[in-house]
């Protein structure tokens, strides 16, 4: 976990101001509206069954 303005989050994660910690970009498939997802290169689309089982 990083404070803003210090070393960046590790590869595959992005800083969340809302949660005040680095978060896994992989979470953006499930929670695409999360603030940290803006810092993730590309959030892969969820499999059909995860979104609409």
């Amino acid at each position: 976990e990083q404070a803003p303005g210090t070393a960046p989050c590790s590869r595959g994660s992005s800083w969340s101001a809302d949660l005040d910690k680095c978060m896994d970009c992989a979470s953006c498939r499930a929670r695409p509206k999360s603030d940290f997802c803006l810092g993730c290169a590309a959030a892969p689309p969820a499999p059909f069954r995860l979104l609409w089982p």
Epitope: C25, A30, L50, P53
Partner: antibody
Framework: EVKLEESGGGLVQPGGSMKLSCVAS????????MSWVRQSPEKGLEWLAE??????????HYAESVKGKFTISRDDSKSRLYLQMNNLRAENTGIYYC??????????WGQGTTLTVSS | DIVLTQSPASLTVSLGQRATISCRAS??????????MQWYQQRPGQPPKLLIK???NLDSGVPARFSGSGSGTDFTLNIHPVEEEDAATYYC?????????FGGGTKLEIK
Amino acid sequence: EVKLEESGGGLVQPGGSMKLSCVASGFTFNNYWMSWVRQSPEKGLEWLAEIRLKSDNYATHYAESVKGKFTISRDDSKSRLYLQMNNLRAENTGIYYCTGGFADYFDYWGQGTTLTVSS
Amino acid sequence: DIVLTQSPASLTVSLGQRATISCRASQSVSTSSYSYMQWYQQRPGQPPKLLIKYATNLDSGVPARFSGSGSGTDFTLNIHPVEEEDAATYYCQHSWEIPYTFGGGTKLEIK
């Protein structure tokens, strides 16, 4: 400190009903997906049901084995999670865990409450 | 449903040595970028505890002697060096789709 505390377990006869409850503290309950997971010697760990956020219109998802029998619900104002279980059978015996996750994993677990279905 | 098969069912490892636990999924749980596989530790009488999410990412507070690897259908949890407190049952869990499922568990004993 994160805490999830289940209650409502006990002994129930086959065909009976039971409602489990879980009270959460130490994290932002209304920003977490919540689930119930059962553990039994026969079937190990089984995910049963999930409820998402208000922004998801409290979408719910169920394992096929409990669909139509179990109902998950939440009360964000009380930081509480519920599981209404109807038409219980012996195979529903086990430890029921209340779990919370920011996304599609289980960050936080309660200590569990034991349900025994037997005549 | 995706079936997760763990191996071995149990293993005994000497203190300070390496423990390797495998989890095989009945279909791929990975995209080109991420793998949707978690690992949990359950000590006797306790609930499971999240160790690793998305195949490789240690949860906060988890010691660096735990590591996860793999993609597609084959995943591995490594513990090195093993400590006495690592005696527990370890489970994998996928989040590729609903229903989420768990592996049958691997019981680790320390000698």
